[in-house]
Interface confidence: medium
């Protein structure tokens, strides 16, 4: 019985040590954050500004409201959701899509007509920043004015109309080399992505004054790489599961391994009224032990450690992902600044 | 003599160990990078695409050229410059400046006239993205047309002219609440910043059909926060010295402390033709020993370690700053993707 009592005491002492250690870590982190904020804002001391002065100086105006409103919804801690920003996978910025064949786009002789574009599931309509159709116009022998029409194929209407215009433009071409011309098709693409069944293809016409078509729609000899294509710029903020993303603990956790703990920094509690928004934010901190292959930041860290004759101390518990906070503050010169302060929130802890 | 020989041998052996260790680290890093790239691009295996297929599919078009041309100048290693992007200090995005008093702007009765704006040295003319003057127009009782004039005070000209127009506009106001109106003053602000002596202030007039001025220039009772103000959006990419930024070593270095070593990854050497650009890139890796307070990533790490009963193994040599690479590649579906792959380059090593 004495043995189990001793074991219990050791366990209690261990928990108590862990508690004191975490308390210490919390305190250090808060003090460090205060120093960091002043230092990152290049301020020697906290601006001395009263609440009354703030009330008087703060414009009751749209741009300020917009900035402050961002903070009304308190930045949610990333540990709450099962999905978080994916900072591991590649973020797609530009997708270049070549035309493919389609049953809809057939000429009377059965040959395919240009152009039908299939879209990757990667492209979501609300993520499209820019979409350009690029067409190549063959060289001309004499100076000519070219009328370009980009038409969208639609289901035949009652009056027999099968097309609707996307864009038309006039180009003055000089003899010499052919030219690439881009046409904004963002709205059309977004419609297609919202209603894929409406994507029946497009028709490209680029007629000179004599009605000759200069657009390369199906490359002839020596015309490789001159097909029309779509250049789509997307914002890609992929999400991935928080699985394998590092442990999250709370103050009551008995976890001894490397873990992220919650820590809220309250500016009002320091009397920092000069910070207009946010009034508080979740900073978090890392604490805990690291085993060799536990929660390593890079997939190859364990390979390195296996072969490491001098690295036997092993990896340590450290922030593996940090994010900035946006801050609205008075700088003590009758100026309100809205800026971004890097690396103020611990998003993830790991052994690296 | 024997003693010094032994010492020399130990030293050689130490260097040799370090060499072997670094060789091992290099190898691990290259293998990890290959795995990372495929994994980050969500590819199970490297796309099987021939050089001929690439030649055929690759559009010979401006947007592709632009993307590829970025790689012609090989991304220079950040260790070469004495200044690098400052990822520590806050980046200013918006500065809101309230008017201050000026000797130039006096009415006949000696009361100050609105408005004179002093500018922070933080605002450089070539960093100004947007500058809006916001003015508040008091509510009207009946529908009215307001003619707004924003005038710039200048040194009196020969003909006595003291003003030049910045902007004039017509507003149709409905009864009810007052309105905030913004006016683009970017060009004026840039001129003031280039030639501060030309900043003598502005005058704001907003007259209704009866000649009443609706602009709040000096707030009356209940008009706190309705002053005119300037909202300036700036791009701020501060630089800071590489001092205290972590050590850089080369393969011949005898440095035992935590250091960044060069490592070039060559895709052509793996036969990865599906990567259009870059053909090679500088990845780098970290290696070396960590003492307690050497090169710590966060200013408070040493405080934490001092109080750490279980962290006595100390901090470890790990990337403290990583950057992405941009990549242009075929995804094997007739699509060319241009995207950003996070955390592929070690920019800085430190003990954390």
């Amino acid at each position: 019985n004495e043995g189990s009592e001793r074991e219990e005491n050791v366990e209690k002492e261990g928990l108590c040590n862990a508690c004191a250690w975490r308390q210490n870590t919390r305190y250090s982190r808060i003090e460090a954050i205060k120093i960091q904020i002043l230092s990152k804002l290049r301020l020697e001391t906290a601006p001395n500004i009263s609440k009354d002065a703030i009330r008087q100086l703060l414009p009751r105006a749209p741009p300020l409201r917009e900035l402050i409103d961002q903070y009304d919804v308190q930045r949610d801690d990333s540990s709450d959701g099962s999905l978080e920003d994916d900072d591991y996978h590649a973020t797609t910025e530009t997708i270049i899509t070549m035309p493919t064949e389609s049953d809809f786009l057939m000429q009377a002789d059965g040959k395919p007509k240009c152009c039908f574009f299939k879209f990757s599931s990667k492209i979501q309509y609300n993520k499209v920043v820019k979409a350009q159709l690029w067409i190549y116009l063959r060289p001309v022998k004499t100076p000519t004015t070219v009328f370009v029409q980009i038409l969208r194929l639609i289901k035949p209407m009652k009056d027999g109309t099968r097309y609707t215009g996307i864009r038309s433009l006039k180009l003055d071409m000089s003899p010499g080399t052919g030219i690439w011309q881009s046409i904004d098709v963002k709205t059309v693409l977004q419609n297609w992505l919202k209603q894929p069944e409406s994507n029946l293809g497009i028709e490209i016409k680029a007629l000179d004054e004599n009605g000759h078509d200069l657009a390369v729609t199906f490359p002839g000899p020596g015309e490789d790489g001159l097909n029309p294509f779509l250049e789509v710029k997307v914002t890609d903020t992929p999400k991935r599961s928080r699985r394998d993303f590092g442990l999250d603990c709370d103050e009551h956790s008995t976890e001894s391994r490397c873990c992220r703990y919650p820590l809220t920094v309250d500016f009002e509690a320091f009397g920092w009224d000069w910070i207009i928004a946010p009034k508080r934010y979740k900073a978090n901190y890392c604490s805990g032990e690291c085993e060799f292959v536990f929660l390593q930041k890079y997939p190859h860290t364990h390979l390195v450690h296996q072969a490491n004759p001098r690295g036997s101390a092993g990896p340590c518990c450290t922030p593996t992902k940090m994010s900035p906070i946006n801050m609205l503050y008075f700088n003590g010169k009758e100026q309100i600044i809205y800026g971004k302060i890097p690396a103020m929130v611990v998003d993830r802890c790991g052994c690296s | 003599n024997e003693g010094s020989e032994r010492e020399e041998n130990v030293e050689k052996e130490g260097l040799c160990n370090a060499c072997a260790w670094r060789q091992n680290t290099r190898y691990s890093r290259i293998e990890a990078i290959k795995i990372q790239i495929l994994s980050k691009l969500r590819l199970e295996t490297a796309p099987n695409i021939s050089k001929d297929a690439i030649r055929q599919l690759l559009p010979r078009a401006p947007p592709l050229r632009e993307l590829i041309d970025q790689y012609d100048v090989q991304r220079d290693d950040s260790s070469d410059g004495s200044l690098e992007d400052d990822d520590y200090h806050a980046t200013t995005e918006t500065i809101i400046t309230m008017p201050t008093e000026s000797d130039f702007l006096m009415q006949a009765d000696g009361k100050p006239k609105c408005c004179f704006f002093k500018f922070s040295s933080k605002i450089q003319y070539n960093k100004v993205v947007k500058a809006q003057l916001w003015i508040y127009l008091r509510p009207v009782k009946t529908p009215t047309t307001v003619f707004v004039q924003i005038l710039r005070l200048i040194k009196p000209m020969k003909d006595g002219t003291r003003y030049t127009g910045i902007r004039s506009l017509k507003l149709d106001m409905s009864p009810g609440t007052g309105i905030w109106q913004s006016i683009d003053v970017k060009t004026v602000l840039q001129n003031w910043l280039k030639q501060p002596e030309s900043n003598l202030g502005i005058e704001i007039k907003a007259l209704d059909e009866n000649g009443h001025d609706l602009a709040v220039t000096f707030p009356g009772p209940g008009e706190d926060g309705l002053n005119p103000f300037l909202e300036v959006k700036v791009t701020d990419t501060p630089k800071r010295s590489r001092r205290d930024f972590g050590l850089d070593c080369d393969e011949h270095s005898t440095e035992s402390r935590c250091c960044r070593y060069p490592l070039t990854v060559d895709f052509e050497a793996f036969g990865w033709d599906w990567i259009i650009a870059p053909k090679r890139y500088k990845a780098n890796y970290c290696s070396g020993e960590c003492e307690f307070v050497f090169l710590q990533k966060y200013p408070h790490t040493h405080l934490v370690h001092q109080a750490n009963p279980r962290g006595s193994a100390g901090p470890c040599c790990t990337p403290t700053k990583m950057s992405p690479i941009n990549m242009l590649y075929f995804n094997g579906k007739e699509q060319i993707i241009y995207g950003k792959i996070p955390a592929m380059v070690v920019d800085r090593c430190g003990c954390s």
């Epitope: 009328f147 029409q149 038409l151 009056d159 027999g160 109309t161 099968r162 097309y163 215009g165 038309s168 433009l169 006039k170 016409k205 007629l207 004054e209 004599n210 009605g211 000759h212 | -």
Partner: antibody, heavy 119, light 106 residues
Framework: QVQLVQSGAEVKKPGASVKVSCKVS????????IHWVRQAPGKGLEWMGG????????IYAQKFQGRVTMTEDTSTDTAYMELSSLKSEDTAVYYC????????????WGQGTMVTVSS | DIQMTQSPSSVSASVGDRVTITCRAS??????LAWYQQKPGKAPKLLIY???DLLSGVPSRFSGSGSGTDFTLTISSLQPEDFANYYC????????FGGGTKVEIK
């Protein structure tokens, strides 16, 4: 070079209809938009409507809605404008004009067709 | 409907004079505005499109400016062959013409 050649002058009685033709030569008719503009003696230009030779779709000025019909015959590269229920105030020179696309200026004009409405 | 108001309705000028004709749209039409020249008994001829782009073959003494609602046609140095009627036309949605300006010899 693209040219628009219109049919000859017409004299019509009030209440009758008139059909003016506009033949396109020297270019691909199907790419053009043909608009119709009229000008009463001593007055300014008045837009009546247009037709896309490509799709056959039409757009009419509100003033002429229900009284004007614009058609095209791709086999002869000809556009037509028919105005019904003629009144004396319809006496004018009627021009056809080519637009490169629906929303565009008129870069090539026909020579005009004089239509006189008189009892 | 967007109305196009052209002024003046007539202008008397001499060879070498600078002549300015204005055209106002009742609503913003961006730069969807063309200017035409019409001589007696002839069809109109397009001079300027997109408010300021001179058609090829049109002398450089003609210039156009403006955007939104206010537009100007300027003849920098009037020549004998420039005496004619001038019309502005908006060509966004349903096209419509201004009332015209007669440039006559003083």
């Amino acid at each position: 070079q693209v040219q628009l050649v219109q049919s000859g002058a017409e004299v019509k009685k009030p209440g009758a209809s008139v059909k003016v033709s506009c033949k396109v030569s020297g270019g691909t008719f199907s790419t053009f938009h043909i608009h119709w503009v009229r000008q009463a003696p001593g007055k300014g230009l008045e837009w009546m409507g247009g037709i896309s030779a490509y799709s056959g779709s039409t757009i009419y000025a509100q003033k002429f809605q229900g009284r004007v019909t614009m058609t095209e015959d791709t086999s002869t590269d000809t556009a037509y404008m028919e105005l019904s229920s003629l009144k004396s105030e319809d006496t004018a020179v009627y021009y056809c004009a080519r637009a490169r696309y629906v929303d565009d200026a008129f870069d090539i004009w026909g020579q005009g067709t004089m239509v006189t409405v008189s009892s | 409907d967007i109305q196009m108001t052209q002024s003046p309705s007539s202008v008397s000028a001499s060879v070498g004079d600078r002549v300015t004709i204005t055209c106002r749209a009742s609503e913003d039409i961006s730069n969807f505005l063309a200017w035409y020249q019409q001589k007696p008994g002839k069809a109109p001829k397009l001079l300027i499109y997109a408010a300021s782009d001179l058609l090829s073959g049109v002398p450089s003494r003609f210039s156009g400016s403006g955007s939104g609602t206010d537009f100007t046609l300027t003849i920098s140095s009037l020549q004998p062959e420039d005496f004619a009627n001038y019309y502005c036309q908006k060509y966004i949605s349903a096209p419509s013409f201004g009332g015209g300006t007669k440039v006559e010899i003083k």
